[in-house]
């Protein structure tokens, strides 16, 4: 029969696991919110009739189903910041692109872990910044919906 000490340690483990899952859920929701915020600003940019933002190419993973695939998002944060930096001077109301991207990067690292040995396999087909953001928003939504509550 399990001793009271082993029962309490397994309960503690279960609690810790539940806590980790809750944190993971929070980080995913934070990432989702940040990406949606960026996309809505892009859509606003579209309404300002400034289509040259769509000349920039972004790369998406061949397939993204796990948190480790967020490495592919992290790899593209530099180019994303470049686009935001360039567009800030043209009615793109994002106060601090560097800070915004930095926050996304921190959230991504928390979710995928700091191990950078996983090499992303990018799709040959490139995407516009709008499609890039939409794809990662869909990824977050998919992981959130399949996570145990």
């Amino acid at each position: 029969a399990p001793t009271s000490s082993s029962t309490s340690s397994s309960t503690a483990e279960a609690q810790q696991q539940q806590q980790q899952q809750q944190q993971q859920q929070q980080h995913l929701e934070q990432l989702l919110m940040d990406l949606q915020e960026l996309l809505s600003r892009m859509e606003n940019y579209r309404n300002l009739k400034l289509p040259r933002m769509l000349t920039f190419k972004f790369y998406l993973p061949k397939q993204a189903t796990e948190l480790k695939d967020l490495q592919c998002l992290e790899d593209e944060l530099g180019p994303l910041r470049h686009v935001l930096d360039l567009t800030q001077s043209k009615s793109f109301q994002l106060e601090d692109a560097e800070n915004f991207i930095s926050n996304i990067r921190v959230t991504v690292v928390k979710l995928k872990g700091s191990d950078n040995t996983f090499e992303c396999q990018f799709d040959d087909e490139s995407a516009t910044v709008v499609d890039f953001l939409r794809r990662w928003i869909a990824f977050c939504q998919s992981i959130i919906s399949t996570s145990p509550q």
Epitope: R46, L48, K49, L50, P51, R52, M53, L54, T55, F56, K57, P79, H82, V83, L86, K90, S91, E125, S126, T128, V130, D131, R134
Partner: antibody, heavy 126, light 108 residues
Framework: QVQLVQSGAEVKKPGASVKVSCKAS????????ISWVRQAPGQGLEWMGW????????NYAQKLQGRVTMTTDTSTSTAYMELRSLRSDDTAVYYC???????????????????WGQGTLVTVSS | SYELTQPPSVSVSPGQTARITCSGD??????AYWYQQKSGQAPVMVIY???KRPPGIPERFSGSSSGTMATLTITGAQVEDEADYYC???????????FGGGTKLTVL
């Protein structure tokens, strides 16, 4: 249907200025930009610059900076390109072209120069 | 200033595949566009966003891009495809546009 109608041919002396107009019809003028492209006789296409008909933002080719000015008059849906201090190597056909984006399946793509004016021949000769 | 480099001329026989290349340092991060210009006419877009065909452009026209090189391919070139072809893109900042020097396609 979309049309860009340009002003007629011009003959100018070196050092003079020329102003070419481009009247747009068949679409919402302020939803697009206008680029100006020129082509010297027997030569390739050269992008000169771009103006947003929405807010008047401009970007000019580096080599023409200081000599070219692009403007729009939204009340008449007309774009203008003025080139100053003309030289003989400015002899060319000058085109205006619509520049914007297309949206379908909720995706957007930059869609430059889907409609062009008929071209305006500017001859610079002493 | 930013440049796009194209071969001055390409020749193919009718029915053959013509490939016209365009190289530029910013192309890994910028989409390429292709225009066809026949003698005495304004240019016509045949490819946008590296590989997409505008409505009305025949299926034999296709585009691709890899690294610093974009390619326009005409599969089964026809005599009426004889024209000058220009690639077009924007610099790494996105504000300044540039055309390649143009390629004269001859379909003999």
């Amino acid at each position: 249907q979309v049309q860009l109608v340009q002003s007629g041919a011009e003959v100018k002396k070196p050092g003079a200025s020329v102003k070419v107009s481009c009247k747009a019809s068949g679409y919402t003028f302020t939803s697009y930009g206008i680029s100006w492209v020129r082509q010297a006789p027997g030569q390739g296409l050269e992008w000169m610059g771009w103006i947003s008909a929405y807010n008047g933002n401009t970007n000019y080719a580096q080599k023409l900076q200081g000599r070219v000015t692009m403007t729009t008059d939204t009340s008449t849906s007309t774009a203008y390109m003025e080139l100053r201090s003309l030289r003989s190597d400015d002899t060319a056909v000058y085109y205006c072209a619509r520049e914007g984006a297309i949206y379908y399946d909720s995706s957007g793509y930059y869609f430059p120069f889907d409609y062009w004016g008929q071209g305006t021949l500017v001859t610079v000769s002493s | 200033s930013y440049e796009l480099t194209q071969p001055p001329s390409v020749s193919v026989s009718p029915g053959q595949t013509a490939r016209i290349t365009c190289s530029g340092d910013a192309l890994p991060r910028k989409f390429a566009y292709w225009y066809q210009q026949k003698s005495g006419q304004a240019p016509v877009m045949v490819i946008y966003g590296d590989s997409k065909r505008p409505p009305g452009i025949p299926e034999r026209f296709s585009g691709s891009s890899s690294g610093t090189m974009a390619t326009l391919t005409i599969t089964g070139a026809q005599v009426e495809d004889e024209a000058d072809y220009y690639c077009y893109s924007t610099d790494s900042g996105g504000d300044v546009s540039v055309f390649g020097g143009g390629t004269k396609l001859t379909v003999l």
